[in-house]
């Protein structure tokens, strides 16, 4: 608020007020008499720049007049009273308010004194993010989108991630004039590393106490990746048995595990148990190489593996040992 | 209703003194500010000044400064201008007028200068 | 100070006729106008404040209008009993300054 004058009555109110999109508004405008000042009102006007004519006056014989009656009420002005307090309520914001609107009173003996005050009009935008299902494209792809629909002005939206990517980010008009929607792709290229990672989109506009922060999780669609545990290149003869593990991330999850080998068919020792395949003891040496094939519904991948089971004496800490 | 009820007309010998009242009914007498216009014959309106029955507070046209005083009796509800050292261009129809812009106005009195 | 310019100090009009009278302000005084009417031998009577607004009881067919330095009064559908001067007024600021008149004159 601008300071007030010294010796003479200055009027006070805020250089800019906001108001939303079809709600009311109060314009706020006092008149402030120095103490020892005396000052008589006989008029409060509002006048828009740009526009000829008064929108609203209050007069001390004739009360109040409007332009747009239903839309303005003088919210303390009353006849019989001193003249103070020229604030003025619009009702039904529409975006052709927005703009610079002058406050004047008629006083004796100073003279007219006036303020102008800028009305903004905005609208709150709502705000919406969602993942970008994406498959293994090896280019650039929209994994997330996050969109501010119906603000004014339009919304200033950022991406927070520790992966990297790209925004792009484009304005439509909304569905109410005046108003933008604001659409904004967080793009990266796709990999298996990225699958339900968290990337944040963050919304700031003049309308929010604070930005809005929304988290989007990321899916990639990708084959399995096979890989084969268990085995320490450690087994020997007569030892008890052992299980190796077929590990496979995959989105979506696995559908099947198929274990086999390099000539065929498992062997009688081994015995497929879903992703788990059991080695049971053997009494001759083995030199096997292993094949666990996973499917899910974007394919099927798989791992190899070559098991030795070697003669020797087994040790303490060997990877198959007796009962 | 509101009224104002100005005193008859005057001649005047140049370099003499007149003082004009208005008095108001139908209003709270310190409600409305009140002004004095002339207006010489056949000629344009000229603000002399106005004032406030409230406090007293006065505002002269610079032109007027000197020539007019303007007073009030709240008691009587009564406005007052005193025109002085008057010469044949003092001669005119004064009005006073109440209210910003000027809504009620009185019937005018007809102040004649002369020898 | 503010100087009130009416440039036509005579118009001419017939009954049921629409006229103007214009009047320009030195400088901007916003809609700090009025207009008044005199009819001859009578006290100005006041029908327009802030440049466009009626006081209550002045015929519909007066129409005020304009803001910053330029102010028109109309009337349309003019009467007999319109024969009158015609005098704007601004009063944004000391002193108040009135024009210099326009007298309506009727056919």
């Known amino acids: 608020w601008p300071p007030p004058g010294t010796g003479d009555v200055v009027v006070q109110a805020p250089t800019q007020v906001p108001g939303f999109l079809g709600d009311s508004v109060t314009l706020p405008c006092y008149l402030q008499v120095p103490n020892m000042e005396v000052t008589h009102v006989s008029q409060l006007t509002w006048a828009r720049h740009g526009e000829s004519g008064s929108m609203a006056v209050f007069h001390q014989t004739q009360g109040p007049s409007y332009s747009e009656s239903k839309r303005l009420e003088f919210v303390a002005a009353r006849l019989g009273a001193e003249l103070r307090n020229a604030s003025l309520r619009m009702f039904g914001l529409r975006v052709e308010d927005e703009g610079n609107y002058t406050c004047l009173f008629v006083t004796f003996p100073q003279g007219s004194r006036s303020v102008d005050i800028w009305l903004r009009v905005l609208a709150k935008p709502q705000n919406t993010a969602e993942v970008q299902k994406v498959q293994l494209t090896g280019e650039p792809v929209p994994m997330a989108r996050c969109v501010s629909t119906g603000g004014r002005p339009p919304a200033q939206i950022t991406w927070h991630s520790d992966l990297g990517g790209m925004p792009n980010t484009s304005q439509v008009p909304g569905f109410l004039s005046g108003t933008v929607t604001v659409t904004s792709l967080w793009i990266l290229v796709p990999s298996s590393q990225v699958d339900g990672k968290n990337v944040t989109c963050k919304v700031e506009h003049e309308s929010f106490e604070k930005p809005q922060l929304l988290t989007v999780n990321l899916t990639v669609y990708y084959p399995p990746e096979v890989s084969i545990s268990g085995y320490d290149n450690n087994w020997y003869l007569g030892q008890n048995e052992a299980t190796l593990t077929c590990d496979a991330r995959s989105n979506p999850e696995p559908t099947g595990y198929n274990w086999s080998t390099t000539m065929g068919p498992l062997p009688p020792f081994a015995v497929a148990q879903g992703a788990q395949l059991l080695i049971r003891p053997v009494d001759k040496p083995i030199n096997t190489t292993l094949i666990c094939n996973v499917t899910n519904a974007l394919g099927a991948r798989q791992a190899e593996l070559t098991v030795q089971v070697k003669e020797g004496p087994p040790s303490e800490h060997s990877g198959i040992s007796r009962n | 209703e509101v009224q104002l009820q100005q005193s008859g007309p005057e001649l005047v010998k140049p370099g003499a003194s007149v003082k004009i009242s208005c008095k108001t009914s139908?209003?709270?007498?310190?409600?409305?500010?009140m002004h004095w216009v002339k207006q010489s014959h056949g000629e344009s309106l000229e603000w002399i000044g106005g004032?406030?029955?409230?406090?007293?507070?006065?505002n002269y046209n610079q032109n007027f400064k000197g020539k007019a005083t303007l007073t009030v009796d709240k008691s009587s509800s009564t406005a007052y201008m005193e025109l002085r050292s008057l010469t044949s261009e003092d001669s005119a129809v004064y009005y006073c007028?109440?209210?910003?812009?000027?809504?009620?106005w009185g019937q005018g009195t007809s102040v004649t200068v002369s020898s | 100070d503010i100087v009130m310019t009416q440039s036509q100090k005579f118009m001419s009009t017939s009954v049921g006729d629409r006229v103007s009278v214009t009047c320009k302000a030195s400088?901007?005084?916003?809609?700090?106008v009025a207009w008044y009417q005199q009819k001859p031998g009578q006290s100005p009577k006041a029908l327009i404040y802030?440049?466009?607004y009626r006081y209550r009881g002045v015929p519909d067919r007066f129409t005020g209008s304009g803001s910053g330095t330029d102010f028109t009064l109309t009337i349309s559908n003019v009467q007999s009993e319109d024969l009158a001067d015609y005098f704007c007024?601004?009063?944004?600021?000391?002193?108040?300054?009135f024009g210099s008149g326009t007298k309506l004159e009727i056919k």
């Open positions: 007028a109440g209210v910003i812009p000027l809504e009620y």
């Open positions: 139908g209003y709270t007498f310190t409600e409305y500010t």
């Open positions: 004032i406030d029955p409230n406090n007293g507070g006065t």
């Open positions: 400088q901007n005084v916003y809609t700090n």
């Open positions: 802030s440049a466009s």
């Open positions: 007024q601004q009063y944004n600021s000391y002193p108040l300054a």
